[in-house]
Structures are given as structure tokens and as C-alpha cells.
């Protein structure tokens, strides 16, 4: 807390400017309208104010709104954004993409802050969904920023958003996120053709179900293998070794390689050698001819 | 290399003018508020003006407000110390410093152990 002084004759401050870095925190404080601040914050990133003067300034601030401050005012924080923490900021109401934009460009190029989760959060909360425009823009800004959200929060995002989404946005997403984030891709994405459409979807593949791999697999879609390697296990095991082969096209000489890991290596157990034998792969661990598979799950929904 | 150097400085007697210069360089020099400090024997250092890094604004505290101006040249890399009714208590030895203007930097522009370069130092005795 800055001690409240008078200002001493002829320093008190017509507007922001320059002169102002000369000031020390106490005549800060005693000498500049929190109000006149107020309506000149676009100045405060063109002068070359300390950590500690900032410090006063930010004070002057709080003193003004302690409420929070209006949008006006955030809009033009810019660096001084930096000296706000989460509480500051969940007092605030963030309505405009172009005030969300310009906070996040102070940040460009670093970690996402606990400060910009909480801006993130308040102005999706504001929106109420997280729209394309949105999400557009804390993709370009954090493209994990999808990955980062819970199923809850991405149930909120509208299929027309899909289209804002990159593959390495989807880099660091879980099976739980992608079970969500499919079927609104697949929403989003129905009306184009084979081989566009599969562009589109392929890196949402990690949340498709069984029967959407099988009419992928008629469809000529060569899936690479690191794509594969991404499905949901659960989703590849009922895949017949014909379905696979059809899916991966060319590639599928890849599995060789992956018969260690899954889903490959599931996938495997669960097939006739004979089937696998077909391949030419030399693919080992299949189920051995003449002996009969009982599909338990099977037995049970019919007793 | 940073070099800052002074020079200017001579016996003056009271009511008397000096014009002190600095000459920097090894910096970008525009990117730097300077400043003239002075030291008296025994006696701490102290600030006795400032030019932000454009020139546009200075700092005088008052003890030398109305005699003292300071001014630069971006161009030549000059800053100078324009000292007018100099007094017995003016003596001492006068320091060109430099400090990087940035925002969010450390301290402030009038402590001088904030400031980044300093000269050799120029002496000014003001004598009758």
C-alpha cells in the first residue's frame, strides 16, 4: 500500500505521459487521477514505467472499480494485463472477441497463464458456448487450447465450430475428448464427399465407434498408421482382418511393426491366424485354426 | 564494449557556467535514459537530472530546478549537462549514467543503482 501524500506543487499529472517515469510511487499515487488513468490506458504500454510504478498504477485502478474494472478500461491494459492475478480478473465481464484478443497478444508466446485460463473462462462463460469465431481465435493463440478442456466444457462447443479446428489442435487430447469431439465433427463434416470428407474427420478418428470404421473401411480411405494407432481399441477389435485391410490400404504393411502395441496387438489376439495369415505380414498371436471363439459378452446379453 | 565519457568538467567560481558532455557508445543509445549523478566527498551519490530515452521529458530535483538543464542528441550519441549560477555547494565529481527504458524494468529512474553504465566521472569545483 502506497502511503496517501499530497502532491506537490505544479507535479500533478494533465495527462499520461513520459515525464510520469520520473515520479516516485508515493508521488504516483498523490499525483495522478485514478480517472484520467482510466481514460488514457492506451499510453501506459508506450512508456517505460517500472515494475514498482506499475505496481501504483494498477492500485490507482482497483481503488476506481473495485467491482471490477469495465471493458473499456481492459481493453486497453495491455502489459499492465500481466499484473493482474485469476481474482482480478473473475470480477470482470469480458464480452468483446477483439478485448479477448488483445489481452492474449501480451501473452503470445509464453505458457498459457493461470491468468488468461481465467479470461479464457470468463468470456466463454459470457458467451455462454464456445462459438467459431472463439474458438478460432485461442486456437491461433494456444492450439491445445481445445485439449485443455474437460468433456463437460467441450460439450458446449457447436458442431459449426469444428471448423476452426487444426490436426495439431487435437495433439494432446484423450480418448474422452475425442468421443465428445466426434460426433460433432462427423455432424459438421457430413455433407462433403469420400475422400474430403476424410481429410476432414481423420484427426477426430480417436473418439469414431466401430460401425463408422467399417463404412470408412468401403469407402478407400488408406488410413496411415499413425492415425490407426490412435483409434479407440474397443472400436478396432470387432474390425474382421478384410475391414483392415481395406482401411489402411497400402499402409497396411505398417502393422507389422506396431504387433507389440495397441490397438495392433489386441486387434491380433482377437483374430484367425488363418485371417492374419492372409496378409503376408507374418503376423504371430492370432487365434490358432480349430479352435472355436465364444463372445461372452454374447452369452450374457442373451441369458 | 559500453563505454560512457565524460568531459567538461574545471574550476568554475560561484554564480559560473559549465557545459558537461557524454559521449556514449556500445549501446543503442535511444533506448537508454540517462542521467547526470554527482558525489561530493563524503557524501552519497545523487541524481541531478534525467532525459527520457526521446528527449522529450526531464527530471531536475529541486535543488538544481531553474539552473541545471539537461539535453541529448540521439544522432551523435551525446548527452549534456548545461550547469548555470553554480554554487559552492555544486562541487563534487560528476557521473554520465545510463539506464535501458523498458516497461516492467527494475527499480526506478532515480536510484542509482539502477542505472546500467556508468563513466569515469568528470570533477567540478566551484571556487572563488
Known amino acids: 500500500e502506497v502511503e496517501k501524500t499530497a502532491c506537490p506543487s505544479g507535479k500533478k499529472a494533465r495527462e499520461i505521459d513520459e515525464s510520469l517515469i520520473f515520479y516516485k510511487k508515493w508521488e504516483l499515487e498523490a499525483c495522478v487521477d485514478a480517472a484520467l488513468l482510466a481514460t488514457q490506458m492506451d499510453r501506459v504500454n508506450a512508456i517505460p514505467f517500472t515494475y514498482e510504478q506499475l505496481d501504483v498504477l494498477k492500485h490507482k485502478l482497483d481503488e476506481l472499480y473495485p467491482q471490477g474494472y469495465p471493458e473499456s478500461v481492459i481493453q486497453h491494459l495491455g502489459y499492465l494485463f500481466l499484473k493482474m492475478s485469476p481474482e482480478d480478473i473473475r470480477k470482470w465481464n469480458v464480452t468483446s472477441l477483439e478485448t479477448l484478443k488483445a489481452l492474449l497478444e501480451v501473452n503470445k508466446g509464453h505458457e498459457m497463464s493461470p491468468q488468461v485460463a481465467t479470461l479464457i473462462d470468463r468470456f466463454v462463460k459470457g458467451r455462454g458456448q464456445l462459438d467459431k469465431d472463439t474458438l478460432d481465435t485461442l486456437t491461433a493463440f494456444y492450439p491445445g487450447y481445445l485439449c485443455s478442456l474437460s468433456p463437460e466444457e467441450l460439450s458446449s462447443v457447436p458442431p459449426s465450430s469444428i471448423w476452426a479446428v487444426r490436426p495439431q489442435d487435437l495433439d494432446t487430447c484423450d480418448p474422452r475428448q475425442l468421443d465428445v469431439l466426434y460426433p460433432k465433427a462427423r455432424l459438421a463434416f457430413q455433407n462433403m464427399n469420400g475422400s474430403e470428407y476424410f481429410v476432414k474427420i481423420q484427426s477426430f478418428l480417436g473418439g469414431a465407434p466401430t460401425e463408422d470404421l467399417k463404412a470408412l473401411s468401403q469407402q478407400n480411405v488408406s488410413m496411415d498408421l499413425a492415425t490407426f494407432m490412435k483409434l479407440r481399441t474397443d472400436a478396432v477389435l470387432p474390425l474382421t482382418v478384410a475391414e483392415v485391410q481395406k482401411l489402411l490400404g497400402p499402409h497396411v504393411e505398417g502393422l507389422k511393426a506396431e504387433e507389440r502395441h495397441r490397438p495392433v496387438r489386441d486387434w491380433i489376439l482377437r483374430q484367425r491366424q488363418d485371417d492374419l495369415d492372409t496378409l503376408g505380414l507374418g503376423l504371430q498371436g492370432g487365434i490358432p485354426n480349430g479352435y472355436l471363439v465364444l463372445d461372452l459378452s454374447m452369452q450374457e446379453a442373451l441369458s | 564494449e559500453v563505454q560512457l565519457v565524460e568531459s567538461g568538467g574545471g574550476l568554475v567560481q560561484p554564480g559560473g557556467s559549465l557545459r558537461l558532455s557524454c559521449a556514449a557508445s556500445?549501446?543503442?543509445?535511444?533506448?537508454?535514459?540517462m542521467g547526470w549523478f554527482r558525489q561530493a566527498p563524503g557524501k552519497g551519490r545523487e541524481l541531478v537530472a534525467a532525459?527520457?530515452?526521446?528527449?522529450?521529458?526531464?527530471y531536475y530535483p529541486d535543488s538544481v530546478e531553474g539552473r541545471f538543464t539537461i539535453s541529448r542528441d540521439n544522432a551523435k550519441r551525446m548527452v549534456y549537462l548545461q550547469m548555470n549560477s553554480l554554487r559552492a555547494e555544486d562541487t563534487a565529481v560528476y557521473y554520465c549514467?545510463?539506464?535501458?527504458?523498458?516497461?516492467?524494468?527494475?527499480?526506478?529512474?532515480?536510484?542509482?543503482?539502477?542505472?546500467?553504465?556508468w563513466g569515469q566521472g568528470t570533477q567540478v569545483t566551484v571556487s572563488s
Open positions: 556500445g549501446i543503442t543509445f535511444s533506448n537508454y535514459v
Open positions: 532525459i527520457t530515452a526521446s528527449g522529450g521529458n526531464t
Open positions: 549514467a545510463a539506464k535501458r527504458a523498458y516497461w516492467g524494468s527494475d527499480g526506478d529512474y532515480q536510484g542509482y543503482y539502477y542505472y546500467d553504465y
